[in-house]
């Protein structure tokens, strides 16, 4: 009685919301027919950013069908925090949860799915739906991976050298330059799980007037640039 | 392979109830939800409500509500639909649908009974 | 309760020529990102088939010349290309909290 294998569609909310919401459910035409009696463990990665709302979705089984609904919660040096609704007494029970944002859509009874009001880092981690039927489990995994945008900087720190950063990111941007130069890129580790890029490069061809930093990151692509003039210029700054 | 066997064509009279079965076999029998739906000569499908043998759970369509009554008989892994004060207009072919877990679709029927109401 | 309203009521298609037919629900049968939408096949003397589920899945053993689409409260299934023993009534029907079918939609092949 397991979840056929399956292939998933995230969904974004219009831009013009005041917090933007994502949810991570079926893209329908991609479930497989194998309806395997092998209990099977179906795991997503799912990227987030930072500071939307997250709904998480269980396999897609009527109510009348299950026993009980369990959403386990991991999350990176917490006790495993674990949701439950038991159909036959109409009650909810929480072990371990202490984070106040995440919380049920609404009454399981009604509805099963998971919502993560404002994603902070801290809700890097494992979410697991396990509905239990009177004939087996069916599991839906999450590997949410919280993403923070970062902070791009370019400016020109002396004759011909400019330096582009990108500060605070999750994961860590990648920096690549227009035209390539004689570059040097440092990474710094911050303990919340950013990470600041720093890219300086240097032109010795004279011919080169203008430069180009563009950052790569999940959460958007950013491009900077900037005129090498002989002496330090103007500082360049943005967000992605 | 899952099979569901239903019982023979009844024909009753006016007022009378009918007592319809539906054998299961080939899987666990109280695992899985049993619908009855029933269709009238030319009509479309409707469904009159299903019962859940592993807890005796049961939710009838409004339409059928006091005249219905849907059982299970876990030794013979059968489940019963009965509909009582029959008129002609209950004349119809009844089945019985197994729901499966993944997207609660039916993917096993009954091959249909069918109940003739006459005087 | 939800409604669903099947368009056309019957329809005629030569053999090799595409069918299409609608489902329209009364409100939205789109839960958690499933559609909770089904499409069976019924033949004469024969109860009904399961050939799509959850909207577009097509159900084990069932050819792929049938499709489905849609969601939220418009659904569509597509049988192309039409073969001769395609002639059957077909129903939607929504299954997720109480449970309805369309009105059911006749084929004929010409």
């Known amino acids: 009685a397991a979840q056929p294998n399956n292939s998933l569609m995230l969904q974004t909310s219009k831009e013009n919301h005041a917090l933007a919401s994502s949810s991570l459910c079926m893209d329908e035409k991609q479930i497989t027919q194998n309806y395997s009696k092998v209990l099977a463990e179906v795991n997503t990665s799912w990227p987030v950013k930072m500071a939307t709302n997250a709904v998480l979705c269980c396999p897609p089984i009527a109510l009348r069908n299950l026993i009980i609904i369990t959403w386990e919660i991991i999350l990176r040096g917490q006790p495993s925090c674990t949701k439950a609704y038991k159909k036959e007494t109409n009650e909810t029970k929480e072990t371990n949860c202490t984070d106040e944002r995440i919380t049920w859509v609404s009454r399981p009874d009604q509805n099963s799915d998971l919502q993560i009001r404002t994603v902070a880092i801290t809700h890097d981690g494992y979410y697991r739906c396990i509905m239990v039927t009177p004939d087996g489990n069916f599991h839906r995994g999450y590997h949410l991976q919280v993403l923070v945008t970062p902070e791009v900087t370019l400016f020109q720190n002396r004759n011909r050298t400019a330096v582009c950063k990108a500060v605070a990111g999750k994961p860590a941007a990648h920096i690549s330059w227009i035209p390539e130069g004689d570059c040097a890129t440092k990474q710094e580790y911050w303990s919340n799980g950013t990470v600041t890029v720093k890219s300086t490069c240097h032109w010795e061809v004279h011919n080169v007037s203008t430069v180009t930093c563009h950052v790569s990151h999940l959460t958007g692509n950013k491009s900077l640039y900037i005129e090498l003039l002989p002496v330090p210029g103007a500082k360049k700054s943005a967000k992605l | 392979q899952v099979q569901l066997v239903q019982s023979g064509a009844e024909v009753k009279k006016p007022g009378a109830s009918v007592k319809v079965s539906c054998k299961a076999s080939g899987y666990t029998f109280t695992s899985y939800v049993m619908h009855w739906v029933r269709q009238a000569p030319g009509q479309g499908l409707e469904w009159m409500g299903y019962i859940n043998p592993y807890n005796d759970d049961t939710n009838y369509n409004e339409k059928f509500k006091g005249r219905v009554t849907m059982t299970r008989d876990t030794s013979t892994s059968t489940v019963y639909m009965e509909l009582s004060s029959l008129r002609s207009e209950d004349t119809a072919v009844y089945y019985c649908?197994?729901?499966?877990?993944?997207?609660?679709?039916?993917?096993?029927w009954g091959q249909g009974t069918l109940v003739t109401v006459s005087s | 309760d939800i409604v669903l309203t099947q368009s056309p009521a019957s329809l005629a298609v030569s053999p090799g020529q595409r069918a299409t037919i609608t489902c329209r629900a009364s409100?939205?049968?789109?839960?958690?990102?499933?559609?909770?939408m089904h499409w069976y096949q019924q033949k004469p003397g024969q109860p009904p088939k399961l050939l799509i589920y959850?909207?577009?899945n097509l159900e084990s053993g069932v050819p792929a010349r049938f499709s489905g689409s849609g969601s939220g409260t418009d659904f569509t299934l597509t049988i192309n290309p039409v073969e001769a023993n395609d002639t059957a009534n077909y129903y939607c029907?929504?299954?997720?909290?109480?449970?309805?079918f369309g009105q059911g939609t006749k084929v004929e092949i010409k």
């Open positions: 959850l909207a577009s």
């Open positions: 409100k939205s049968v789109s839960t958690s990102g499933y559609s909770y």
């Open positions: 649908a197994r729901e499966d877990y993944y997207g609660s679709r039916w993917g096993t």
């Open positions: 029907q929504h299954s997720h909290e109480l449970l309805t």
